[in-house]
């Protein structure tokens, strides 16, 4: 009915789903048939697909709606052309003419928008032993209006990080520790400089890669180890070592040795596997008392760390396989026999 709907001015933040224009065409064919039904299509001026047209089948009214956000920065003025056509093909020899087309001019006005981060989340991986002042990552944002951006961190509760306000580069300012929990997540804020100081928030996730910073130790409490005295034959016991490092590519491979040379006449230690070793007596001539055997455990890491642990072993008289002590003789009677 109308071929030019004139100018339509909208702010770029107009809600998706909004009806911005009502259009009407007529068809002289029999009502409520495929011949008279009208479909509207935008054929020019909306290559981004920001607009759509819904048709009321009873009235053949078309409603132009916003399908995607309008954007002043990429398309301030658009000359929109749409076509009204039947869902059924026209009879042979009849063509759509100029009256089947209409147009309007969409003018989008600028609205100051917050900066936009290039990613929803920024992730970086860094070894936990990095030197203070090391760059551990960076974030980037752009302001749609082209304003400068200032970056800041929020929620750096461990006090590990600082951000360059201009470049978005993130640096360590304190020793990092994977054992405190990884990933370490903080918020990054981008604020436009000038304008209305609008800001937006993203996240920075720092994944801490383990380094060898925990010395080996005994995997459990080995108090209460005993041998029955006197020994009838050399005896042995098995113990397990562990550490608190994360062994990403293979399990721990500890090596074991006696902690001092003076122990070598009485004891020997032999590796069973990467985590277990056997402590054996070299003879049977031990006194009826507690011996503290020092064991040196090396983790073979980079750098290698060593722990010296003590295994208390008691030689005691036994009754039915358990240590026997006269009443009141001593406290802390060993309970684990080997």
């Amino acid at each position: 009915e109308k071929s030019d709907y004139g100018n339509l001015t909208l702010a770029e933040d107009t809600n998706i789903g909004s009806t911005i224009l009502t259009i009407q065409a007529t068809d002289a064919d029999e009502p409520f048939t495929g011949s008279s039904k009208i479909l509207y299509h935008i054929i020019k001026g909306d290559s981004e697909g920001r607009l759509g047209v819904d048709t009321d089948p009873h009235t053949n009214t078309g409603y132009v709606i916003i399908k995607k956000p309008l954007d002043f920065e990429t398309a301030a003025v658009s000359n929109i052309v749409f076509k009204a056509e039947n869902p059924e093909p026209l009879v042979f020899g009849v063509k759509y003419n100029a009256s089947s087309f209409a147009k309007f001019t969409l003018i989008v006005t600028d609205v100051n928008e917050a900066p936009q981060f290039s990613q929803h989340v920024f992730q970086a991986k860094v070894s936990e032993d990095v030197a203070i002042g090391t760059k551990v990552g960076n974030v980037t944002a752009k302001d749609p209006e082209g304003l400068d951006i200032s970056y800041s961190l929020r929620g750096d509760t461990r006090g590990w990080l600082k951000i360059d306000h201009v470049t978005g580069e993130i640096f360590s300012v304190a020793p990092l520790d994977r054992e405190a929990g990884s990933p370490y997540r903080v918020q990054v804020v981008a604020t436009e400089v000038g304008g209305s100081s609008l800001s937006s928030v993203s996240e920075f996730h720092l994944i801490l890669m383990d380094v060898n910073d925990n010395p080996p130790r005994l995997a459990k409490d080995y108090t209460g180890l005993f041998f029955c005295h006197p020994l009838s034959a050399p005896g042995s016991l098995i113990f397990e070592a562990t550490d608190d490092d994360q062994h990403l590519f293979r399990g721990p491979h500890f090596t074991f040795s006696l902690g001092s040379g003076s122990l070598q006449n009485d004891w020997e230690v032999s590796k069973i596997n990467g985590t277990h070793a056997r402590l054996s007596t070299r003879h049977t001539e031990f006194e009826e008392r507690e011996y503290v055997v020092l064991i040196r455990i090396n983790d073979g890491g980079r750098p290698p760390l060593e722990g010296i642990v003590s295994l208390p072993v008691t030689f005691c008289s036994c009754v039915e396989g358990s240590c026997f002590r006269p009443a009141g003789h001593q406290t802390g009677i060993p309970t684990v026999g080997m």
Epitope: H120, V121, K125, R154, G155, D156, T157, G181, S182, P183, Y184, R185, V186, Q187, E203, I207, M209, Q246, L248, F249
Partner: antibody
Framework: QVQLQQPGAEIVRPGASVKLSCKAS????????MNWVKQRPGQGLEWIGA????????NYNQKFKDKATLTVDTSSSSAYMQLSSLTSEDSAVYFC????????????WGQGTTVTVSS | DIVMTQSPSSLAMSVGQKVTMSCKSS????????????LAWYQQKPGQSPKPLIY???TRESGVPDRFIGSGSGTDFTLTISSVQAEDLALYHC?????????FGGGTKLEIK
């Protein structure tokens, strides 16, 4: 849509190794972590480990550090898990699962491969 | 490692009833850096792989019916099904995605009477 395709079953001998595959489609493979999860019959879920296909960084559950090795082939958008020195304890369903958008929950799961260790 | 404990291990409910199940964490899952709770819930129907229902403790995965509601903060979390349906018969798992290694609870099995 996102799809993670896994073979249905593998039967292996005790002491042998098996390499499970997970072919991803419907998203950019290098943008998301790939996780592997074990489920024994009638039991809960256990996280084995994860790999970031963008740089092949791996993170393992300590319990599986000597059992599983995770790799990826970015050219075919495929993730792999090799299980070694298999015992009856390794008989289970193994799922691959893609990380979520912006964090580390498991947004998409494969159908799982049933591994049976039997002589 | 963070230990996740789910209860009850199983429960049987009639269609239309309200269901609640609990998940407790051995460590705080609320990040002071982002103010998010890093807890997810999954539904696993018999013979199928798990399907995500909830992440960040209360954010529903797209396509999940709104009868599934995640709540809680810190160490105590709840999955509520406001009006249980026959198709909700499944094993429900919680998982912390706060710190490596990611860990799951033992599961809650929901049966329909």
């Amino acid at each position: 849509q996102v799809q993670l395709q896994q073979p249905g079953a593998e039967i292996v001998r005790p002491g042998a190794s098996v390499k499970l595959s997970c072919k991803a489609s419907g998203y950019t493979f290098t943008d998301y972590w790939m996780n592997w999860v074990k489920q024994r019959p009638g039991q809960g879920l256990e996280w084995i480990g994860a790999i970031d296909p963008s740089d092949r960084y791996t993170n393992y559950n300590q319990k599986f550090k000597d059992k599983a090795t995770l790799t990826v082939d970015t050219s075919s958008s495929s993730a792999y898990m090799q299980l070694s020195s298999l015992t009856s304890e390794d008989s289970a369903v193994y799922f691959c699962a893609r990380g979520g958008y912006g964090d580390y929950w498991f947004a998409n799961w494969g159908q799982g491969t049933t591994v049976t260790v039997s002589s | 490692d963070i230990v996740m404990t789910q209860s009850p291990s199983s429960l049987a409910m009639s269609v239309g009833q309200k269901v609640t199940m609990s998940c407790k964490s051995s460590q705080n899952l609320l990040s002071s850096g982002t103010q998010k709770n890093y807890l997810a819930w999954y539904q696993q129907k018999p013979g199928q792989s798990p399907k995500p229902l909830i992440y960040f403790a209360s954010t529903r995965e797209s396509g999940v019916p709104d009868r599934f509601i995640g709540s809680g903060s810190g160490t105590d979390f709840t999955l509520t099904i406001s009006s249980v349906q026959a198709e909700d018969l499944a094993l429900y798992h919680c998982q912390q995605h706060h710190y490596f290694p990611w860990t799951f609870g033992g599961g809650t099995k929901l049966e329909i009477k």
